[in-house]
């Protein structure tokens, strides 16, 4: 499934702190003494930014003063900074901050592209740890649903510590985590199989870390296009990590000529970038919310996070709409290959397969599509939603919309097309996934505007859980079994094997036409929902005591 | 009690073919797979071919020394394997031994757990 | 291809006596190498799988050990029934391999 499994995982996050600047502006001087030390003295949830010899530096998630030594430096509110340097001091905003949000961007980017490098790193050699280890197919299944269930599982769990605790602490351990995974994982002996089923369980449980936090700290740097364009370039690092997790793969096992070597690139270059994390991305708070201290926390369950983003409308859609983007990329990555294999021998420009991998060469053809059209699917959702933003305020989900509609007309014609022309069904394949993915980082900007900031990490996990469960957990299964019960049916020919496998895919376009319909649902209640949230942000930001969440 | 009996072997000319044929019971033999072996006379142990379960696609792996000239399949609703032998020559003069691999549902070893008494092959002219 | 080499080639020992096989391979297989006996005119038997795992009705005076590329295969106090030929195969990659064998007899 290259490229595309857990997309809408990440999909979905990057979004906490963003409104924060914009935010802090209004806000500058408003409150100089309203619950001064209350405010003064409320914890940080990360350590803040770098503080330069003499003068406050403003951070993305507050001030920070430069303390006489011997006293600790306290993370405040721009209200509490205020309140120290009087009413009408002016914050300097030095040069490098700009720089500083830029590298801690790119080095999350580049954290995320790992991630799939090393997802893929594994699917691309797949075939060599099957032929190791002896795995049927339905062992390598095994492999895919432990990985997808403990992925879906430990969102929720790092949702819940991403909206609490340090950020990038968490994300950091995260790479750590499952770049010692990976690494173990090259040592195991043929005969544990069970324990290669349990690293891909705790890379899952690693990489959920990461998914779900790191796009709510891109949220916190930018804004507006500019979030957008940084979200973009976030979820670049989804084709791109896919790709060169293949070509890792290969080439590594060539080059060495064991595979288990393949498995041990990744890791390092995880353990560099964990280390980066850790030194470059700032602690980033979330939005006002944090700067009220501990308080709001305090408030605020997880039950409450629950029942309130059960009842944002836009959120539940767009994860729905999520959810069948998931099923889709899901099932066509799993079966699209083969399918163009046995049209193939339908067409008889192919034999019959006996000896596996069958459709190779269209494995490598779909991948490099699949990749491809990520980038340019990413682009073309961020250029149009930034374009149609000139025109409507409900541009991004209705840019979702016509995407996922468009991408569904395309992908019924792939089943037209792959009767009498393979070219004519990648093209096909080409336009439809290119509008398909085109809503990756638009859903998440989605779920910023219409998501608290303390609330995004849940936000982020609950939508990359429901988008599993719903979508790629189940839906390559749906798919073959649906397949399967067509062909009793009907006689065994390559024919029908060719038919029946059509017939079921015809299923992936009806769930995108319902993604796109959840989308235009989306679309009616994004404003209401955007402007019940910076309301909500508004009474966040007010004195402590009339705080109601 | 596991058993495999191999039968089909024979004396046969140089370039000529033949078909052994492995008849197996006390195993669950559909989700097992299969191998041959040879072992040429006061020599050693040689593996020919194994062939895998359907839930592996029936994917078949040679030795290089055979690949091309031998063919190995499976018939699970007779519970049968086979290694049909094209363009055999005089090395291939050997005892064949039909062996199973130890089966853990999502995996199979690649170690041989039972094997059959032999059947033996002369190329000779 | 990995190549097996076993030593010696040939074994003369009392009824007794414990002896050491040795199996080396080519390059570093982790734990994937069996150990068969094989009884004249007899077909092969698997006696330990993955370089010390004891196989069920196997005595248990056999016993395996080794990783990487060295792997030993011990029979505590030889009996009269254990003369005969023992392989080694590794399973760590394909082509399936067996070393030439290590024939046991009595001294």
């Known amino acids: 499934m290259m490229c595309l499994e857990c997309a809408s995982a990440a999909a979905g996050g990057a979004e906490e702190e963003e409104a924060d600047a914009e935010r802090r502006r209004r806000r500058r001087g408003a409150q100089p003494g309203a619950g001064g030390s209350a405010c003064c003295g409320a914890r940080g949830v990360g350590g803040a930014g770098v503080v330069s010899a003499d003068e406050e530096v403003q951070t993305l998630s507050g001030s920070v003063r430069r303390v006489p030594s011997g006293l600790p430096s306290i993370p405040s509110t721009p209200g509490c900074a205020a309140a120290a340097k009087g009413p009408s001091a002016p914050q300097p905003k030095p040069a490098s901050l700009g720089r500083g949000r830029g590298a801690a961007a790119a080095i999350l980017s580049l954290g995320n592209v790992l991630n799939y490098l090393d997802r893929y790193t594994v699917a691309g050699v797949l075939l060599d740890i099957q032929q190791h280890f002896g795995v049927k197919d339905r062992g390598a299944g095994l492999l895919q649903s432990v990985f997808i269930c403990s992925f879906m599982v430990a969102a929720p769990i790092f949702g819940y510590l991403g909206d609490r605790f340090n950020r990038k602490v968490i994300l950091s351990c995260g790479i750590f985590f499952w770049s010692a995974v990976t690494f173990s994982s090259s040592f195991i002996p043929q005969q544990y199989f069970w324990l290669l089923v349990l690293s891909r369980g705790l890379v899952g449980i690693g990489e959920a870390s990461y998914s779900t936090i790191a796009p709510t700290i891109i949220g916190d740097l930018f804004t507006k296009n500019t979030r957008t364009l940084m979200l973009s370039v976030f979820y670049f690092a989804i084709p791109l990590g896919s790709g060169l997790g293949y070509i890792t793969g290969s080439s590594v096992k060539q080059a060495a000529g064991d595979w288990h070597w393949a498995l041990r690139v990744s890791p390092v270059l995880g353990m560099i970038t964990g280390t980066l994390i850790l030194i470059l991305v700032p602690a980033t708070k979330r939005g006002h919310a944090d700067q009220l201290g501990g308080q709001l926390k305090a408030r605020t369950s997880w039950l409450r996070d629950m029942k309130a983003l059960i009842r944002n409308r836009s959120y539940v859609f767009s994860s729905l709409a999520t959810s069948a983007v998931s099923f889709a990329t899901g099932a066509l990555g799993m079966w699209i290959p083969l399918y163009l294999h046995r049209a193939q021998v339908v067409q008889k420009t192919a034999e019959t397969c006996n000896s596996p991998p069958c459709g190779a060469k269209d494995s490598l053809i779909f991948g490099a599509i699949t990749c491809f059209t990520g980038f340019l699917g990413v682009v073309t959702g961020a250029g149009a939603t930034r374009w149609c933003r000139l025109r409507t305020q409900r541009a991004d989900p209705l840019v979702c919309a016509v995407g996922m509609l468009g991408s569904a007309i395309f992908i019924c014609l792939i089943f037209v097309a792959a009767k009498t022309s393979i070219v004519g069904a990648y093209i096909c394949i080409f336009v439809g996934e290119t509008l398909l993915f085109s809503n990756w980082a638009i859903t998440a900007d989605i779920l910023m505007y219409v998501v608290i900031p303390t609330r995004r990490a849940t936000a982020v996990a609950l939508q990359s859980f429901t988008s599993h469960l719903l979508g790629d957990a189940g839906s390559p299964y749906l798919i073959g079994f649906i397949s399967d019960l067509i062909r009793q049916s009907t006689k065994d020919s390559p024919l029908w094997e060719f038919l029946s496998l059509g017939y079921a895919l015809m299923l992936c376009p009806f769930v995108v036409v319902l993604g796109g319909m959840f989308f235009l649902a989306t679309a009616l209640f994004f404003l209401s929902d955007r402007a019940k949230a910076e309301q909500q942000v508004n009474q966040l930001v007010m004195p402590p005591a009339s705080v109601k969440v | 009690e596991v058993q495999l009996v191999e039968t089909g072997g024979g004396l046969v000319q140089p370039g000529s073919s033949l078909k052994l044929s492995c008849a197996t019971s006390g195993f669950t033999f559909s989700d097992t797979w299969m191998s041959w072996v040879r072992q040429a006379p006061g020599k050693g142990l040689e593996w020919v071919a194994l062939i895998k379960d359907k839930n592996s696609n029936y994917e078949a792996n040679y030795a290089e020394s055979v690949k091309g000239r031998f063919t190995i399949s499976r018939d699970d609703s007779k519970r049968r394997v086979y290694l049909q032998m094209f363009t055999l020559r005089d090395q291939d003069t050997a005892t064949y031994y039909c062996?199973?691999?130890?089966?853990?549902?999502?995996?199979?070893?690649?170690?041989?757990?039972?094997w059959g008494h032999g059947v033996m092959v002369t190329v000779s002219s | 291809d990995i190549v097996l080499t076993q030593s010696p080639a040939t074994l003369s020992v009392t009824p007794g006596e414990s002896v050491s096989l040795s199996c080396r391979a080519s390059?570093?297989?982790?734990?994937?190498i069996h150990w068969y006996q094989q009884k004249s005119n007899g077909s092969p038997r698997l006696l330990i799988k993955y370089a010390s795992q004891s196989i069920s009705g196997i005595p248990s005076r056999f016993s395996g050990s080794g990783s990487g590329t060295d792997f030993t295969l011990r029979i505590n106090r030889v009996e009269s029934e254990d003369f005969s030929v023992y392989y080694c195969q590794q399973t760590y990659s394909l082509p399936l391999t067996f070393g030439s064998g290590t024939r046991l007899e009595i001294k």
């Open positions: 390059q570093g297989i982790s734990t994937s």
């Open positions: 062996t199973s691999h130890e089966d853990f549902y999502y995996y199979s070893s690649y170690y041989f757990d039972y």
